[in-house]
Amino acid sequence: GSERTCCPVNWVEHERSCYWFSRSGKAWADADNYCRLEDAHLVVVTSWEEQKFVQHHIGPVNTWMGLHDQNGPWKWVDGTDYETGFKNWRPEQPDDWYGHGLGGGEDCAHFTDDGRWNDDVCQRPYRWVCETELDKASQEPPLL
């Protein structure tokens, strides 16, 4: 594959990454799959600067990010280390709340209306953000 040098149409470039902001809602797993099919991943927030950028674009709306603990520990979908990385949880979060009555806990992270993070039921239909790095090789064959 060739190295992607510019963002696809309708994607926003920022700091050598491309971002796509949904305007509809999907369950976390469906959002995750949508991004993968776009050769991208749910957004991985690695700095306060990136947090502010994403927050600016999504507004005060619950929005999925690429962080979950469905298999035990919290993991970023691209393998970025959670323990040493940037975090922006709301106070008392994540709390893995079982009291919602939907069966199970809260295993997927989202931006809340003030931008800080919360863990919630993964099947809730929230908006989502896809991210892909400009410097990574795309799956498309190079133009001859």
Epitope: Q70, G72, Y82, G103, G104, G105, D107, Q123
Partner: antibody, heavy 120, light 111 residues
Framework: QIQLVQSGGGLVQPGGSLRLSCAGS????????MDWVRQAPGKGLEWVGR??????????EYAASVKGRFTISRDDSRNSLFLQMNSLKTEDTAVYYC???????????WGQGALVTVSS | QSVLTQPPSVSGAPGQRVTISCTGS?????????VHWYQQLPGAAPKLLIY???NRPSGVPDRFSGSKSGTSASLAISGLQSEDEADYYC???????????FGGGTKLTVL
């Protein structure tokens, strides 16, 4: 006390089908992932697959060796877990265990096991 | 060939201490996933022995202890007793396989 009681094992011919059941009691069944693990005669433990809870849309994962042939489902209203096994092969012969998942990643309670023998 | 590597067998005299190793890779143990240990007595279903690398469920004697470092983990059994004779399995989640992986199992013989 917490119990997982299994049923449905038996002898089946290659290419045949079988359904295993696992009934949970003594805890809130709907709040836990459930897995199936198998053990061929004289061999080690092999993970078969997982079904998550409703909050995670009952999503499933399967080992490569059974993907496309086995289906895991659950009925929270009946506190029951199921393993539907199709296109069975001789190498599927094993004792099958259901197991409850604690904190999303370890087995804290196991069923008693159900022997599945695939032979002509 | 198991994804997690354990010695096939270990042995020790009553009262002795033995350790069982479990070596993984960057997609399981090294990816930050905890290692759990299960004991399987002859003819019985497996039983949780150690969870989260080093935690003992209630009812498990403190003779059993676990640890993890990097891509490896180990189970130590001190003050060996005849009833400890069993198969021991380590397990962890694996990102590459998107599932649980087990070690091949270690048969403990109390001499």
């Amino acid at each position: 006390q917490i119990q997982l009681v299994q049923s449905g094992g038996g002898l089946v011919q290659p290419g045949g089908s079988l359904r295993l059941s696992c009934a949970g009691s003594g805890y809130t069944f709907s709040d836990h992932y459930m897995d199936w693990v198998r053990q061929a005669p004289g061999k080690g433990l092999e993970w078969v697959g997982r079904i998550r809870y409703k909050a995670n849309s009952y999503s499933t994962e399967y080992a490569a060796s059974v993907k496309g042939r086995f289906t895991i489902s659950r009925d929270d209203s009946r506190n029951s877990l199921f393993l539907q096994m199709n296109s069975l092969k001789t190498e599927d012969t094993a004792v099958y265990y259901c197991a409850r998942i604690r904190d999303r990643y370890y087995f804290d309670y196991w069923g008693q096991g159900a022997l599945v023998t695939v032979s002509s | 060939q198991s994804v997690l590597t354990q010695p096939p067998s270990v042995s020790g005299a009553p009262g002795q201490r033995v350790t069982i190793s479990c070596t993984g890779s960057s997609s399981n143990v090294g990816a930050g996933y905890d290692v759990h240990w299960y004991q399987q007595l002859p003819g019985a279903a497996p039983k949780l022995l150690i969870y989260g690398n080093s935690n003992r469920p209630s009812g498990v004697p403190d003779r059993f202890s676990g640890s993890k470092s990097g891509t490896s983990a180990s189970l130590a059994i001190s003050g060996l007793q005849s009833e400890d004779e069993a198969d021991y399995y380590c397990a962890a989640w694996d990102d590459s396989l998107n599932g649980v992986v087990f070690g091949g199992g270690t048969k403990l013989t109390v001499l």
